[in-house]
Interface confidence: medium
């Protein structure tokens, strides 16, 4: 028998009391739905309040551990320890003193190795006799390199001015062999700690033109909160060279990223930064020491568009009018211009420091650790946004001889660009690398 669908009896019922009539929907909603909605709204508002509090706290305060307490966010990275365990200064731009002289160096004479005798303070050229791969590795490690070096014999030239000695190793440092006789091979050690300074394409010499990353595979964009702030140069898989003044405003490491491998500003993936290291600020010379090293969280994989540039030789003295190159995404007009989306390149030349320090120019502000470059008639110069990028010189390979640092205006004839002289900071770079090996 089919049961009346409107019957109060359940389908499996025998003689049980009928179920109560179902509540009408409105009554159910009032008794169950409204409290649920109120509970959900309360929960949502609690969550919103908590999130807002967290956002406000995160924006204005920093949480110290042990003991747990908040400090104003403006005390982060101010060079003062405010958290007992120092967390407020942990992920910040760090200063690293200039440190001692590194006892090995490479000369522009075919990248020949020179070794310091610390007892006398004299430098000697390394003889190729009995020079081994292990000694080459030690030399490069002393300069902070971790890659596999290459070396070869080159003939002692007629204008060899340093004494030539055989080299040995002691406590992971190169030393002169005590009983060193004459250099029988008649050859010096030409050492390369890293394959660097080679690009797929050679730039044409014109004024300012669009650049290709194939020409400048070491150029990077240094960005804060996804905004281009400065240029930089890849020195090895872990390290990027740039200017210290790029980090004056933002000294926390977290929000800085490096973009490599493209000539267009927005189009390449960003790389996390582990450390940013500068030299201690010298109030006597506020524009001096405008150099910084950024250590990447993960090493770069080199390719046709991502390659390192070479550091200069210690004796890389460039004479006035030597041709150099500058690159960057900087402002295209001195006032009110906008950042270029495309990498630009220009040929400039070394400008004599005496001329650069003249009364109608920089009036003595250009120190020995700086250099000037531009074109005598003006009009070609680096500008805001190019800071930190390389000033480059080509011999066999490309070398970063300068870092875009400062200047009055952009492209003025008597006030060319001023660059940090990289050769003045080789010791510092090597000491940082060694410390971070």
């Amino acid at each position: 028998m089919l049961q009346d669908p409107d019957s109060d009896q359940p389908l499996n019922s025998l003689d049980v009391k009928p179920l109560r009539k179902p509540r009408i929907p409105m009554e159910t909603f009032r008794k169950v739905g409204i409290p649920i909605i109120i509970a959900l709204l309360s929960l949502a508002s609690i969550i919103i309040v908590v999130v807002l509090i967290k956002v406000i706290l995160d924006k204005y305060y920093f949480l110290c551990g042990q003991p747990l307490h908040f400090i104003p966010r403006k005390q982060l990275c101010d060079g003062e320890l405010d958290c007992p365990l120092g967390e407020d200064e942990e992920h910040c731009v760090k200063s690293f003193p200039e440190g001692p002289a590194v006892a090995v160096r490479l000369s522009k004479d075919r990248s020949t190795l020179q070794v310091l005798d610390s007892a006398t303070g004299n430098w000697f050229s390394a003889c190729f006799d009995n020079f081994t791969e292990a000694l080459a590795e030690t030399a490069c490690r002393q300069m902070g390199y971790s890659s596999k070096p290459t070396f070869r014999a080159v003939e002692i030239g007629p204008d060899q001015d340093l004494d030539v000695v055989e080299i040995t190793e002691n406590s992971q440092e190169l030393r002169m062999r005590n009983s060193s006789g004459p250099c029988l091979s008649g050859s010096l050690v030409s050492l390369h700690c890293l394959a660097c300074g080679k690009s797929l394409k050679t730039p044409r010499v014109v004024g300012v033109e669009e650049a290709s990353v194939d020409s400048w595979p070491w150029q990077v964009s240094i960005q804060y909160d996804k905004q281009h702030v400065c240029g930089g140069s890849i020195l090895d898989p872990h390290w990027v060279l740039t200017a210290a003044h790029c980090f004056r405003k933002h000294t926390d490491v977290f929000n800085w990223k490096v973009r490599a491998g493209s000539d267009k500003l927005g189009s390449f993936p960003s790389l996390a930064v582990a450390k940013i290291i500068i030299i201690e600020f010298n109030p006597m010379y506020p524009k001096d020491n405008d150099i910084a090293l950024m250590k990447l969280q993960f090493p770069l994989t080199f390719s046709g568009t991502v390659r390192p540039i070479c550091l200069p030789f210690f004796d890389e003295e460039l004479t006035p009018a030597t041709p150099l190159w500058i690159i960057g995404w900087g402002f295209t007009k001195q006032n009110g211009g906008k950042m270029s989306d495309i990498l630009l390149q220009a040929s400039v030349q070394v400008i004599d420091s005496t001329r650069c320090n003249a009364d109608d120019a920089y009036q003595g502000e250009v120190t020995e650790k700086m250099m000037c470059a531009g074109i005598p008639e003006g009009g070609v110069d680096t500008c805001q946004g190019d800071s930190g990028g390389p000033l480059m010189y080509q011999s066999d390979q490309w070398h970063v001889v300068g870092i875009v640092s400062w200047g009055y205006g952009c492209g003025g004839p008597s006030t060319p660009g001023v660059y940090t002289k990289v050769s003045a900071y080789l010791n510092w770079i090597y000491n940082v690398w060694k410390a971070e090996l």
Epitope: G79, E80, L81, D82, P84, L85, G86, E89, E90, K94, S95, F96, P97, G99, S171, Q172, E173, N431, K434, A435, E436, L437
Partner: antibody, heavy 120, light 108 residues
């Protein structure tokens, strides 16, 4: 020349407090951090904590949290280290030591040490 | 927390000979390592920092080497005044400092 001169030896009873001073001279007092390190008889060096004489900020090793207080008087270029609730195992020579900054910097100058003996 | 372990605990060497002291870190400390010398009744004295840089006024017979987790202090030709206790210390971008337990260098 740089000098860190500490106060003289102290004998204390368990439960008491001791306050050791370290007077700095020969450099700008506020530009170097001051640390305290102790050495129990025949034992090694144990770092206790730091103080920034410029800001007065301090940080203590977890072992000493709640028992140690470091203060300074910039007018006399002196840093103080007070250790409370003394016990016999606090018997040690207490050294102040200077570091150029808190960062990447070892202790380049040390005080001569202050012997604190805790005995009933 | 980084733990510094020195070996040996005691080293007996004759004057004029070479002494080699070791220090091992429980994790990499780069080259942020210092060596101190302490003579009886005196405060420690900084010898080496940055793993290999001699502090001001330290004789050339003291040399440091190593990086990462393994470090060595070498005294090339021991003088009578070099017999003391030597401590290694890690320092970095945190103000929390750790010392090794020390190596006693004694006359053989």
């Amino acid at each position: 020349q740089v000098q860190l001169v500490q106060s003289g030896a102290e004998v204390k009873k368990p439960g008491a407090s001791v306050k050791v001073s370290c007077k700095a001279s020969g450099y700008t007092f506020t530009t170097y951090y001051m640390h305290w390190v102790r050495q129990a008889p025949g034992q090694g060096l144990e770092w206790m904590g730091w103080m920034n004489p410029n800001s007065g900020n301090t940080g203590y090793a977890q072992k000493f949290q709640g028992r140690v207080t470091m203060t300074r008087d910039t007018s006399t270029s002196t840093v103080y280290m007070e250790l409370s609730s003394l016990r016999s195992e606090d018997t040690a020579v207490y050294y102040c030591a200077r570091a150029r900054t808190w960062l990447l910097s070892p202790f380049d100058y040390w005080g001569q040490g202050t012997l604190v003996t805790v005995s009933s | 927390e980084i733990v510094m372990t020195q070996s040996p605990a005691t080293l007996s060497v004759s004057p004029g000979e070479r002494a080699t002291l070791s220090c091992r870190a429980s994790q990499s400390v780069g080259r942020y390592l210092a060596w101190y010398q302490q003579k009886p009744g005196q405060a420690p004295r900084l010898l080496i920092y940055g793993a290999s840089t001699r502090a001001t006024g330290i004789p050339a017979r003291f040399s440091g080497s190593g990086s990462g987790t393994e470090f060595t202090l070498t005294i090339s030709s021991l003088q009578s005044e070099d017999f003391a206790v030597y401590y290694c210390q890690h320092y970095d971008s945190s103000p929390m400092y750790t010392f090794g337990q020390g190596t006693k260098l004694e006359i053989k």
